[in-house]
Amino acid sequence: SWMWNQFFLLEEYTGSDYQYVGKLHSDQDRGDGSLKYILSGDGAGDLFIINENTGDIQATKRLDREEKPVYILRAQAINRRTGRPVEPESEFIIKIHDINDNEPIFTKEVYTATVPEMSDVGTFVVQVTATDADDPTYGNSAKVVYSILQGQPYFSVESETGIIKTALLNMDRENREQYQVVIQAKDMGGQMGGLSGTTTVNITLTDVNDNPPRFPQSTYQFKTPESSPPGTPIGRIKASDADVGENAEIEYSITDGEGLDMFDVITDQETQEGIITVKKLLDFEKKKVYTLKVEASNPYVEPRFLYLGPFKDSATVRIVVEDVDEPPVFSKLAYILQIREDAQINTTIGSVTAQDPDAARNPVKYSVDRHTDMDRIFNIDSGNGSIFTSKLLDRETLLWHNITVIATEINNPKQSSRVPLYIKVLDVNDNAPEFAEFYETFVCEKAKADQLIQTLHAVDKDDPYSGHQFSFSLAPEAASGSNFTIQDNKDNTAGILTRKNGYNRHEMSTYLLPVVISDNDYPVQSSTGTVTVRVCACDHHGNMQSCHAEALIHPTGLSTGA
């Protein structure tokens, strides 16, 4: 059987000779050189050589435990003559013993960490870790202790864990933001002779909201023309906050002052400025100066710093309204006038009034915008604004006239205003009623008396207030001895009735009936219209079969004896 134990070898051997490891030996070895010892496995023939006769093993090179702590090899004892193994091939171990030849190495050359400013003492910042390649199971070669070389009194390090903590109260970022801390890791439990390594930890204090906004001045003054429309920016104010980011965000608001309703403040998110804007229309003539109280505040406040005071500040903003030469202002936004259509030329319809709103109260002159009254139907008194006709009107031609009047400052013609005038033409009964259409009818030869042969309708261009009321009658010259009668239906229609039994188309083929149509407005208007009646042969149902040929061709042909 094999005769050996585990082999141990000290690392980093510096002797001039090969380092002796141990002896492989079989109890079958008679010491006569008949056996050959063979080594195979990790580093055999290179790192480890064997005297094939004696079984002595030597290490040919300096070994580093941290590179390889254990070598597993195989041993054979073979009869030189036959090649026959005298023992089974066996595995053995060469264990490399540690020496303290490695300093602790930090996992990072430089650490970066952050911690909020004003943190309590003992607040965790970061944990640094150093590893020592030496054997942790043997001695203290790999027992690492941490200490701080640079960075006191601001920070401390826990010797065993490498945890860095704050060590000073009220560290203020606004005073100092960056700290460079140097940490040492030393092996041998920190004892003398231990090896050490260092790392740098760059610590940045992160911002907390421990500073309120502050206006750099207590009063601001801005000017704005009275003509500024709502939304117009007047000026910018800016409070400064020593904090950064979200903690330096500022909201502006108007908290007091007579301009509370007249102005707004909006916050410019990019510049953190407050922009004063016009909220309502200004009027220099009414109020020339406004005072506002504007407040700047942090929207995000940390309750633990409220003891430092309110996180807001106020400033007074004085706004001076500047006078602007304004155009004249009409008394109404629009004027509606009316006039009878029978008005004579130069009839006054009404008047408009405009005033210069400026303190100077410059006089105004009036004119009609001729683009809106191309036919020059109307005119205006340039001094007092009276509107009058310059041409005759006709409601039936145009009911409404829409014109524009211009008011211009006499001293400054550039300042002018315009106002619409809507003129309604009122109806006068100046049109007679007339037939709604041309009437041409027929009567059957065998017609009976009082038979309705045509219904008449009338139209009138006028538009009386109480509606049309037409009356119909035969013209006086045809009323006596007429073959037909007119029956007024009292509903603005009339019927033509036969007055006798039977008509002879050979005796009289066509009758012309003059009908008078009157309205009952003032002054009464009437007209005479003629209805043509033809005598025709009809079937027993009363359907026309034939009429006088000439009458059909010349329906307006004259005949007598209606």
Epitope: K36, R81, T82, R84
Partner: antibody, heavy 117, light 111 residues
């Protein structure tokens, strides 16, 4: 370079003896066993015996035990094989071969021994 | 004595084809995982040359088309792709016990 150089061919009478030499070079002579193998014409290989040059320990096959003697001269790194009481069936080529762990890794060129009356 | 029996006695194989030679020992020649069986090539008029030792280990300088396998009593020499220069007689040999013995040889020729 390992070399094994054998003595020249021999013609012997039946009943006589023959001594074949094998000079080794290119390695440490005492570190390896030296073997002798013969091959009769048209036949296979036949192991005869061997010697440990460092201790002159020998092993012979039973067939040749009484007739064969293997010796060495360490000073000249030469091995010898003497076969006595030769018979016609001993006509063969005789090889020396270096032994290493049971295998023959280097061979001499062979010596032809002819036994004839 | 351990008797070594080779088969076949002769073998004709085409160039590039595989050649397989078997050797059977009359008893086991293996111990502790070591197989004390070796193979030789002998070309005409030359001494034998070691090809394979301990059943499967290729001797330095021998082409890798030669390979050996086997254990206990049955062993094989394989030429994966026969070349013209491989024409020879091949012998197996055991060193497990005295006397050391050879197989009768297998003659390999080109078909």
């Amino acid at each position: 370079e390992v070399q094994l150089v054998q003595s020249g061919a021999e013609v012997k009478k039946p009943g006589s003896s023959v001594k074949v030499s094998c000079k080794a070079s290119g390695y440490t002579f005492t570190n390896y066993w030296m073997h002798w193998v013969r091959q009769a014409p048209g036949q296979g290989l036949e192991w005869m015996g061997d010697i440990d040059p460092s201790h002159s320990e020998t092993h012979y096959t039973q067939k040749f035990k009484d007739r064969v003697t293997i010796t060495v001269d360490k000073s000249t790194s030469t091995a010898y094989m003497e076969l006595s009481s030769l018979r016609s069936e001993d006509t063969a080529v005789y090889y020396c071969a270096r032994g290493d762990l049971g295998r023959f890794d280097y061979w001499g060129q062979g010596t032809t021994v002819t036994v004839s009356s | 004595d351990i008797v070594m029996t080779q088969s076949p006695d002769s073998l004709a194989v085409s160039l590039g084809e595989r050649a397989t030679i078997n050797c059977r020992a009359s008893e086991s020649v293996s111990i502790h995982g070591t197989h004390l069986m070796h193979w030789y090539q002998q070309k005409s008029g030359q001494p034998p040359k070691l090809l394979i030792y301990a059943a499967s280990n290729l001797e330095s300088g021998v082409p890798d088309r030669f390979s050996g396998s086997g254990s206990e009593t049955d062993f094989t020499l394989t030429i994966s792709s026969l070349q013209a220069e491989d024409v020879a007689v091949y012998y197996c040999q055991q060193s497990f016990e005295d006397p050391w013995t050879f197989g009768g040889g297998t003659k390999v020729e080109i078909k």
